[in-house]
Structures are given as C-alpha cells and as structure tokens.
C-alpha cells in the first residue's frame, strides 16, 4: 500500500513535467530506493542541477525565454567546479550566453535567478568586462586563457546554456 501510494505520487509528478520533457533520465540517490533524481533526456546532470546546451543561435532575451519555456533559466555559475563541468560539453569555436547581464549599463551585473553577484566567484577573461554597451555575458574559449567570460551586445545571436534544478521523485 505504501509502495503503491509512492508510485502514484511519482506518476503524478512525472505528468507535471511531461509537457516540456517527455523523457526523463533518473538515478537513485544514495542507498534509499525511494529517492530518485531526474534530468530531462538528453540534459546532463551535475550535483543538484541539470544542464542543456542550446545550439540554436538567439539573442540573450530570446535565449532566456527559450530556457524558461523548458522550466529552466540561462545558466548561473556558482563555483569553479560547476564551470569545469559545463565546459566539458562546449565547443571551443562557439560562444554561449550565461544568465548574467547588466541591463542598466552601470556594471551592476545580475544573475537571472537573483543569486547575488559575487566578484570573487567570477571567471572573466583578462580585461573583461570592457564595454558599457555590451550588457550580456557569454562563456567562450581563448587559446591564451582557456574558457572564460566576456561581455557582448545582448541582441547578437549566440548559443546558450540552460540550467534547472533536478527533479526529485
């Protein structure tokens, strides 16, 4: 009876996500068979989040809307470890929007999910950000410095990275 009600709850939770994510990949968390964490297929997972590399080229605003439709946001990078995981799935000759912008052009950078912007946990390329007209952030590869962030014009289409919390069932 307990297992039955647990299964029913799981099924109803899965139905919530089915509209945007018809397929989920789930793994057992820890030793308890009752706790599963899932990411939409073919998203990748790291710690408590799921990530999707969008290869369609769109402006920053359209990229954020695209992530939002999938129940996600443009990626918020909180640690070096998280960035190191993300870059494994990126192409060196491409640039990808982050969920980081400065819409007022006053160098008040803000993350889409309202995570406080911490200057100590940023990975700007040297000399960046360098232009008050360029109000959105990308991550890209520079041969001299490997992967890092750069400010660019928000309306210039780029690839993007979406991030959402894992789905627990």
């Amino acid at each position: 009876n307990f297992m039955y009600s647990k299964t029913v709850k799981r099924l109803s939770k899965l139905r919530e996500y089915q509209q945007y994510h018809p397929s989920l990949t789930c793994v057992m968390e820890g030793k308890d068979i009752e706790d599963w964490s899932c990411c939409p297929t073919p998203w990748t997972s790291f710690q408590s989040s799921c990530y999707f590399i969008s290869t369609g080229m769109q402006s920053w605003t359209k990229s954020q809307k695209n992530c939002s439709v999938m129940g996600a946001d443009l990626v918020v990078i909180n640690t070096r470890e998280e960035q190191d995981f993300i870059i494994q799935n990126l192409k060196r000759n491409s640039s990808y929007f982050l969920g980081l912008s400065d819409p007022g052009g006053r160098r008040h950078w803000q993350w889409v999910d309202q995570t406080p912007y911490n200057e100590n946990v940023t990975f700007w390329h040297s000399g960046e950000p360098n232009n008050l007209d360029e109000r959105c952030a990308i991550i890209n590869f520079r041969s001299s410095e490997e992967w890092g962030w750069n400010d660019i014009h928000c309306h210039v289409p780029q690839k993007s990275i979406c991030k959402m919390k894992k789905i627990y069932i």
Epitope: S59, T61, K65, D133, R135, H153, H155, V156, P157
Partner: antibody
Framework: EVQLLESGGGLVQPGGSLRLSCAAS????????MSWVRQAPGKGLEWVST????????YYPDSVKGRFTISRDNSKNTLYLQMNSLRAEDTAVYYC??????????????WGQGTTVTVSS | DIVMTQSPDSLAVSLGERATINCKAS??????????VNWYQQKPGQPPKLLIY???NLESGIPDRFSGSGSGTDFTLTISSLQAEDVAVYYC?????????FGGGTKVEIK
C-alpha cells in the same frame, strides 16, 4: 553637437570594391558602438554592420557577410566600411549612425547625411 | 529573422488631425517589461531621425504630439495633431535580435 560625415561613395562596376569613411566629431567616439545602415533608391532601411567601441566585435547580416568589413580608427575618430565583391543590389545611400544601448536592445540615435554607392556596368 | 510589417503604406491626414501608424513584428520583441521597438522619421533628402525608443519613450527634443504604444508583436506610432513639418516617411525597427530589421515605411501626407 554630434556630427557624422560620410565619404567615399561613387560609381563602381559589379565585382569591384569601395571603402567608405565616416568622420565623427562632437562626442567621445572611442566609447561608442557604431553602425552602418543603407537605403536603396526609393526603398526602406537595411542594417549593414555594427562594431563595438574597441573594434574587437563586429556584426553583419547574411546579405553582406564575407563581403563587407567594418573597422574603426579611434585615434582618427573615423569609422570605415570596406565593401568588396559589390553587386547591383548594394546600390544605396550608406549612413553611419551612433548606437545607444537601451536595456537589452539599442537605438540608432544620430545619423550622418549619407554617401551614395552605385554599382553598375 | 524578425519581420516588421507596417500599415498602411501611405496615409493622408488633414492638418491638426490624428495620424496612426501600425507595426507588427513576426514574433514578440518584449522582455522583462520592455519592448525593443524604435520609430524613426525620414524627411525627403534627409537621414532618418529617432522619434521613439523602447516602444513608448519619447526621444529628447521630439515634440510631444508624437507618441508610441504597444507590446509583444503590435505597436503604434501616433501623431496627435498633424503639422505641415510632419510630412515624412516613418519606419519602425526592432532591436531585440540581430539582424536589426525595419518596417517597410509609411508615407504621411497632408490631405
């Protein structure tokens, strides 16, 4: 007072090249993103190119990508447009304009008087 | 690309009367409460001049008989009381995503 003065237009044969210049004054040119916009005879406006203040980021629509190159010399307060492999459909008045950001978008707030490019055999 | 469709192509209005120009975007050009549509005026033999930015913000130095409204995909430029000096072609433009695109223009004349 902001002033933008385009020059370098003229008559050129299909397949030929031309370099347009835009001399800027009345503002701190080196801090402004700049754009070129063109207007074919009796037609509407078409964005041609944009370059950021430092000159390290340039953008083009597909219609001119690979043929046109935007550049700038901040020491001379001058914007350039190098146009190669010109076609009849490139015939237009070419305007340079200053770019002003507006949140995630932008406006073209000051425009020059334009220079005329005619591509014909 | 985002297509901007203006209507009508031309408009004849009596002096002192209201002129209304419409612009429709092929997809939404809004984000976070702002609309990325600008309006320009071009008089014969002159370059375009910025009138309205962000759909409804009046550019400095532009008379307040000009106003802009709309959001999402539908936008309007209104001249509340047409003056002789307003005879021109008016263009809408989106700056939400490259390539920036302009409407085909609306020619405003005196009836």
């Amino acid at each position: 007072e902001v002033q933008l003065l385009e020059s370098g237009g003229g008559l050129v044969q299909p397949g030929g090249s031309l370099r347009l210049s835009c001399a800027a004054s009345g503002f701190t040119f080196s801090t402004y993103t700049m754009s070129w916009v063109r207007q074919a005879p009796g037609k509407g406006l078409e964005w041609v190119s944009t370059i950021n203040s430092g000159g390290d980021n340039t953008y083009y629509p597909d219609s001119v990508k690979g043929r046109f190159t935007i550049s700038r010399d901040n020491s001379k307060n001058t914007l350039y447009l190098q146009m190669n492999s010109l076609r009849a459909e490139d015939t237009a008045v070419y305007y340079c304009a200053t770019y002003r950001p507006y949140y995630y978008g932008s406006v073209l707030d000051y425009w020059g008087q334009g220079t005329t490019v005619t591509v014909s055999s | 690309d985002i297509v901007m469709t203006q209507s009508p192509d031309s408009l004849a209005v009596s002096l002192g009367e209201r002129a209304t120009i419409n612009c429709k975007a092929s997809q939404s050009v809004d984000y976070d409460g702002n609309s990325y549509v600008n309006w320009y005026q071009q008089k014969p033999g002159q370059p375009p001049k910025l009138l309205i930015y962000g759909a409804s913000n009046l550019e400095s130095g532009i008379p307040d008989r000009f106003s802009g409204s709309g959001s999402g995909t539908d936008f309007t430029l209104t001249i509340s009381s047409l003056q002789a000096e307003d005879v021109a072609v008016y263009y809408c433009q989106q700056s939400d995503e490259d390539p920036w695109t302009f409407g085909g223009g609306t020619k405003v004349e005196i009836k």
